[in-house]
C-alpha cells in the first residue's frame, strides 16, 4: 500500500507568492511559493496519486503583514480551503496567547490540530478540551493512518502559551499515545511536529512504533540530487534513521516559507511496516501557475493591508535617527528603539530567580534603512516601519558563549570608518571601544545586563558564560561577516517579523522618545582601562 | 478484520419506535468516540448522534433531541439507537461510525474532521 505526503512547515504567513529569498514579491515571473501556487500543485498530486495527506508541521502563525492584521483568521481560511488533512502546533501558534490560537484557528479549522506533549491544566483544561488533539486517525483510501504531534518544549521561553499549559518531553508524551494507537491496531504512524531536525531523528530513533516524522522548526532543507534553487541541502530527502529497535525511518522536512512542498512516498506491507521511501520537496516556481479561484480570494483579503499600512501605530516626539551617518558609525537612537522593542518582546516571566530569561540585543547597523522624521505630527506608520526594516527578517533568540560576543563586538569595529552594516546596535550591553588600538583588539570594556537578579545592573562579560541574546535573523546565520555567530551559536530559534516586534512595541508604548545614552562609546586613544 | 455491522432497520408507522444496533469485531469500542450518521436521498449526510468511550457523554442533532437515545453495551462490543416518535422525515440510510482519536462527541457528530471507520448502512423507512 503507497502513501504520498505533502508536507510544509514554517510558512510563517507567506499567503502571497514571494521572491527567491521569501521577501516580498517584486519581479511577478521570477517568484515562488504562495497559497495559490501551492494549491495547483497539491490538485495535481491529488488527482494522480490516490492515497495523498497533506500536512502541515506548525509555524503557519507569524511573518508577514497578513498576520498582523489578520491574527491566524488567514490560516483558518486558507489551509481549509487547500483542504489540509491535519497540522501539528509550533511555538509560533502561541504568540497572541491561548486565546489568539483558539478564536482563530482551532475553533475555525476543518482538519485537526495536534500536539501530544502540550498538556492544559487548570481554567483552561475545559476550555481547550477537544480543541487540539494529541492524535488523530484519519482514513486514507481504504486503510487508516495514525498521525501524532508534538510541539518544541522550549515554547514557553518562545512564545506565549501562558501559564495553564504544561511542555512535556516530546519522547516521553509520544510513546504512550503511539503505544495507544498499536493497541487499536492502527499500524501506519506518522509523528509530526515542530521540535526540530535534532529532536525529529531523536523521535525516529526513539519512539517505538512511528513508521515516519514530518518536522519544522528549524528550517532544515532536504535534497537528493542536485538541488534546484539556493538552499544548501542538510541531508537527503528523505533522511533515514535507523531506531533502536532496528527499522530504518524516514525524516522529512521542506525548509520554510512555503517555498517547496514536501513530497514523500511511502511503501507499507500488510502489517504496516515502511517497506521503502522515496521523493524530494519540490520547488513551487513560476513555472507553477497560481490557481486562479485561490488567488482572487488573496486578491480580496489583500485590500485590508494596505489600507492597514498607512494607519497610525503611535507617536514619536523625538527624531528616530536611522541614517547610515549615524547607526554605522555611533549609538543611534533608531537602534536603541529597536533593540528595547526586541527585548520588550521577549519578557517571559518563567522563573522566579530571573526577572526575565533574555537582555541582550545586538542589531547590525547596516539592517536599518531610514530614519523617521517626527515632523510629521509624530505618526508612526506600518509603511514607515517597512521603510526601516525592509527585509522581511526575524529577531530571533541564540545562545552564546560570552566569548563568541567578544568576537562579534571585535568584528563589529575592524574596519571603522569605511560606514560599513556590522557596526553593532544594542540593548542590555554596555561596550567601550578603543579606536586607536589594531583590528581585533579594540573593546576595551563590554559589560552586559544580568538576568539573574531582580535589580537588573550591568556586570562584566564572561567569556566561559552562556548568555541569551536576541538579534536578527541575518546575524544569527552569519550575515555582514559575523561567521563567529553562525559557527559558535549553541541554539538558535526562529523568532517573530522584525517590523511587527517594533510596531507592536510603539503601539504598546503609544509616545516614544529614544535617547542616545552611552550604550557605545568609543575613543580613538589610550585610556586607562583594565581589559575584561 | 475490523468491522462495524449495523442492524434493526426496517419500515415503520409514523409515530413508532426502532432500535438500531451497530455491532464492532476487532474494536476495543471502550476507546473509541461511536457515532450513529444518516444519509437521506438527496441530502448531505448528517450527524444523528454520538457517545464516547471514556466518560459516556452524548450528543444529539436538534432534530432528534428528547426523540433517539444513545447507548452502548461494552461488554458486546455494541452500541445502540433507541429511536422513538418516528416522522417521515427521518427516511434515511442509517450509518454507524467509530473513531479511536481523542474528539469530542460534538465534533465527531458534526463531524469535525474525517471519521476513520463506517458501517455499510441499514435502512429506515418511516411511512404510513
Known amino acids: 500500500w503507497e502513501l504520498t505526503i505533502l508536507h510544509t512547515n514554517d510558512v510563517h504567513s507567506r499567503l502571497e507568492q514571494t521572491s527567491e529569498d521569501s521577501s516580498k514579491c517584486v519581479n511577478a515571473s521570477r517568484c515562488m511559493g504562495g497559497v495559490a501556487r501551492l494549491f495547483t500543485k497539491v490538485q495535481q498530486i491529488r488527482r494522480a496519486e490516490p492515497n495523498v495527506l497533506l500536512l502541515d508541521a506548525g509555524d503557519q502563525y507569524q511573518g508577514t503583514i497578513w498576520f498582523t492584521v489578520y491574527k491566524g483568521a488567514e490560516v483558518a481560511h486558507f489551509m481549509n480551503a487547500l483542504r489540509y488533512d491535519a497540522m501539528a502546533l509550533g511555538n509560533h501558534e502561541f504568540d497572541n496567547g491561548v486565546e489568539g490560537l483558539i478564536e482563530p484557528l482551532l475553533k475555525e479549522a476543518k482538519f485537526p490540530i495536534l500536539s501530544a506533549n502540550i498538556k492544559a491544566k487548570g481554567p483552561l483544561a475545559s476550555q481547550i478540551s477537544g480543541l487540539y488533539l494529541p492524535y488523530k486517525v484519519l482514513p486514507v483510501g481504504d486503510e487508516v493512518v495514525g498521525i501524532v504531534g508534538y510541539t518544541s518544549k522550549e515554547t514557553p521561553f518562545l512564545s506565549n502559551p501562558g501559564t495553564n499549559l504544561v511542555f512535556e518531553d516530546e519522547i516521553t508524551a509520544l510513546q504512550p499515545e503511539v503505544d495507544k494507537l498499536k493497541t487499536l491496531n492502527v499500524n501506519k504512524i506518522i509523528a509530526l511536529g515542530h521540535s526540530g531536525f535534532e529532536m525529529d531523528k531523536l523521535i525516529a530513533q526513539k519512539v517505538r512504533g512511528v513508521d515516519v516524522v514530518v518536522g519544522g522548526h528549524s528550517n532544515t532543507f532536504l535534497y537528493t540530487g542536485n538541488p534546484p534553487s539556493k538552499e544548501v541541502p542538510a541531508g537527503k530527502y528523505p533522511f533515514i534513521v535507523t531506531s533502536d529497535d532496528g527499522r530504518k525511518v524516514p525524516v522529512v522536512q521542506a525548509y520554510a516559507f512555503g517555498k517547496y512542498l514536501g513530497y514523500l512516498k511511502i511503501e507499507f506491507d500488510e502489517r504496516g511496516n515502511v517497506i521503502s521511501s522515496h521523493g524530494n520537496p519540490i520547488l513551487l516556481n513560476s513555472s507553477i501557475p497560481e490557481d486562479p479561484s485561490i488567488k482572487a480570494d488573496i486578491n480580496k483579503w489583500r485590500i485590508k493591508l494596505d489600507n492597514y499600512s498607512t494607519q497610525e501605530l503611535g507617536k514619536t516626539i523625538v527624531y528616530l535617527d536611522g541614517s547610515s551617518q549615524s547607526c554605522r558609525f555611533r549609538e543611534c537612537n533608531m537602534g536603541n528603539l529597536i533593540c528595547d522593542a526586541m527585548i520588550n518582546n521577549n519578557l517571559r516571566h518563567t522563573d522566579e530567580m530571573f526577572w526575565n530569561h533574555v537582555s541582550m540585543c545586538i542589531l547590525n547597523g547596516g539592517g536599518i534603512r531610514s530614519p523617521i522624521d517626527e515632523r510629521n505630527n509624530g505618526t508612526i506608520t506600518w509603511e514607515n516601519l517597512a521603510a526601516v526594516l525592509p527585509f522581511g527578517g526575524t529577531f530571533d533568540l541564540v545562545q552564546l558563549k560570552g566569548s563568541t560576543l567578544k568576537k562579534a563586538f571585535e568584528h563589529s569595529v575592524h574596519r571603522y570608518g569605511q560606514s560599513t552594516g556590522e557596526f553593532l546596535q544594542v540593548g542590555g550591553i554596555h561596550v567601550v571601544y578603543d579606536l586607536s588600538r589594531k583590528p581585533g583588539d579594540r573593546v576595551v570594556k563590554l559589560d552586559v545586563l544580568c538576568t539573574k537578579c531582580r535589580v537588573p545592573s550591568y556586570d562584566p562579560l564572561k567569556m566561559d558564560e552562556v548568555y541569551k541574546v536576541i538579534l536578527p535573523n541575518f546575524l544569527a546565520n552569519g550575515g555582514d561577516g559575523f561567521q563567529m555567530i553562525k559557527d559558535e551559536l549553541l541554539r538558535h530559534d526562529s523568532g517573530d517579523q522584525d517590523i511587527n516586534v517594533v510596531s507592536t512595541y510603539i503601539s504598546k508604548m503609544k509616545v516614544i522618545y529614544p535617547a542616545v545614552e552611552g550604550r557605545i562609546k568609543a575613543h580613538h586613544h589610550h585610556h586607562h582601562h583594565h581589559h575584561h | 478484520q475490523r468491522q462495524l455491522v449495523e442492524s434493526g432497520g426496517g419500515l415503520v408507522q409514523p409515530g413508532g419506535s426502532l432500535r438500531l444496533s451497530c455491532a464492532a469485531s476487532?474494536?476495543?469500542?471502550?476507546?473509541?468516540?461511536i457515532g450513529w450518521f444518516r444519509q437521506a436521498p438527496g441530502k448531505e449526510r448528517e450527524g444523528v448522534s454520538c457517545?464516547?468511550?471514556?466518560?459516556?457523554?452524548?450528543y444529539y442533532a436538534d432534530s432528534v433531541k428528547g426523540r433517539f437515545t444513545i447507548s452502548r453495551d461494552n461488554s458486546k462490543n455494541t452500541v445502540y439507537l433507541q429511536m422513538s416518535s418516528l416522522r417521515a422525515e427521518d427516511t434515511a440510510v442509517y450509518y454507524c461510525?467509530?473513531?479511536?482519536?481523542?474528539?469530542?462527541?460534538?465534533?465527531?457528530?458534526?463531524?469535525?474532521?474525517?471519521?476513520?471507520?463506517w458501517g455499510q448502512g441499514t435502512l429506515v423507512t418511516v411511512s404510513s
Open positions: 461510525a467509530a473513531d479511536p482519536s481523542p474528539v469530542t462527541v460534538q465534533a465527531m457528530c458534526l463531524p469535525r474532521f474525517p471519521v476513520p471507520y
Open positions: 476487532g474494536f476495543l469500542l471502550d476507546y473509541y468516540v
Open positions: 457517545i464516547s468511550g471514556s466518560d459516556r457523554s452524548t
